[in-house]
Interface confidence: low
């Protein structure tokens, strides 16, 4: 990226751009990682790998887990299946809006949207409509920073995921993720 | 150094069009958002459109949506503000604005701070 | 469409005094939210983004802060430069709205 002429901003933690790159990062390797696990490579997916430092990788393996929990969660999958892909960015904005439409944020909340969004790219790709793996991502960045970056500064950043899910009962925080994307595609159903 | 430089304006009819250009220095076009932003005469800002040019995504204001375009030209890094049907309630400063940079490529419509703008430029719209 | 309901639409201080202008949002806007600087005939200045951080060479004295659906541009101790008019900017869901401006003046 040609970044001249940009000054650099704070970089701690629970700053903007901090929370805004790390969760970049997350949301690129989570993406990368369930697609990897359809077999086969998906070049639409080969975006450049970033570095990540060690706290970005036990976020990554944090979010990994709950992804494969998700993914055997029968019911969440049926849902998502039954999604209609011909206006993706309505869908995604509607069901994104309504995870959090009750003005409680959790951070099992943020990750059901992270894998809400990794199910509309692995859509999108059995469909063939690569162009809108990046513009999803786009969507769910933009989702983050305009509804969801103000609470992650309060959680003191992204490290307070893994305390979130670092406990024994992280199954059944699962659960409950899976019971709020659940949720929010069937009101999207009832509304579509 | 980043510079925006804005052009086209100018005195136009009722009904006319105008094609106001942004000319960006300094920075890619492509990883940015660019805005456009109005003035009327002794009131306050008003945002009219944006784009992210790296998904060709454009968002408007109701006021001018139908009427007005924006397009980027990447090879040219210039930003475009095509106005149809001009009304005299157009009649304002127009600037174009830089908005947040994308992240590893892949930012979003980047509706965001504007951190640098250009010095506008006046569009009248009278008979 | 979010609203931004800025307030005081006009203020007279003295150099040296504490100023404080806030934004309602109509509704959540979480940290989009921007402070820009206007002086007449020129065009605005980003001051600060994420409702809270400062701008690169931004002064000190100028800091944003965030209670629910209210956002407040502080300058801590305002100087003569400072005289001009303040404009709050949301951004939600790619539509931008801007506040309708708070002009600061010699008293």
């Known amino acids: 990226m040609d970044g001249s002429g940009e000054q650099p901003r704070g970089g701690g933690p629970t700053s903007s751009e901090q929370i805004m790159k790390t969760g970049a990062l997350l949301l690129q390797g989570f993406i990368q990682d369930r697609a990897g696990r359809m077999g086969g490579e998906a070049p639409e997916l080969a975006l450049d790998p970033v570095p990540q430092d060690a706290s970005t990788k036990k976020l990554s393996e944090c979010l990994k887990r709950i992804g494969d929990e998700l993914d055997s969660n029968m019911e969440l999958q049926r849902m998502i299946a039954a999604v209609d892909t011909d206006s993706p960015r309505e869908v995604f904005f509607r069901v994104a809006a309504d995870m959090f439409s009750d003005g409680n944020f959790n951070w099992g909340r943020v990750v059901a949207l992270f894998y809400f969004a990794s199910k509309l790219v692995l859509k999108a790709l059995c469909t063939k409509v690569p162009e809108l793996i990046r513009t999803i991502m786009g969507w769910t960045l933009d989702f983050l920073r305009e509804r969801l970056l103000g609470w992650i500064q309060d959680q003191g950043g992204w490290d307070g995921l893994l305390s979130y899910f670092g406990t024994p009962t992280w199954q059944t925080v699962t659960i409950f993720v899976a019971g709020v994307l659940t949720a929010s595609l069937t009101i999207w159903k009832k509304m579509g | 150094e980043v510079q925006l430089v804005e052009s086209g304006g100018g005195l136009v009819q009722p009904g006319g069009s105008l094609r106001l250009s942004c000319a960006a220095s300094?920075?890619?076009?492509?990883?940015?958002?660019m805005h456009w932003v109005r003035q009327a005469p002794g009131k306050g800002l008003e945002w009219v459109a944006s784009?992210?040019?790296?998904?060709?995504?454009?968002y408007y204001a109701d006021s001018v949506k139908g009427r007005f375009t924006i397009s980027a030209d990447t090879s040219k890094n210039t930003a475009y503000l095509q106005m149809n049907s001009l009304r005299a309630e157009d009649t304002a400063v127009y600037y174009c604005a830089r908005g947040g940079a994308y992240y590893f490529g892949y930012y979003g419509s980047g509706s965001y701070a504007m951190d640098y703008w250009g010095q506008g430029t006046l569009v009248t719209v009278s008979s | 469409d979010i609203q931004m309901t800025q307030s005081p639409s006009s203020l007279s201080a003295s150099v040296g005094d504490r100023v404080t202008i806030t934004c309602r949002a109509s509704?959540?806007?979480?940290?989009?939210v921007a402070w820009y600087q206007q002086k007449p005939g020129k065009a605005p200045k980003l001051l600060i983004y994420?409702?809270?951080s400062l701008y690169s060479g931004v002064p000190s004295r100028f800091s944003g802060s965030r209670s629910g659906t209210d956002f407040t541009l502080t300058i801590s101790s305002l100087q003569p430069e400072d005289f001009a008019t303040y404009y709050c900017q949301q951004s939600s869901y790619s539509l931008i709205t801007f506040g309708q401006g708070t002009k600061v003046e010699i008293k």
């Open positions: 994420s409702a809270s």
């Open positions: 784009i992210s040019p790296y998904y060709g995504y454009t």
């Open positions: 509704q959540s806007v979480s940290s989009a």
């Open positions: 300094g920075f890619n076009l492509s990883y940015y958002s």
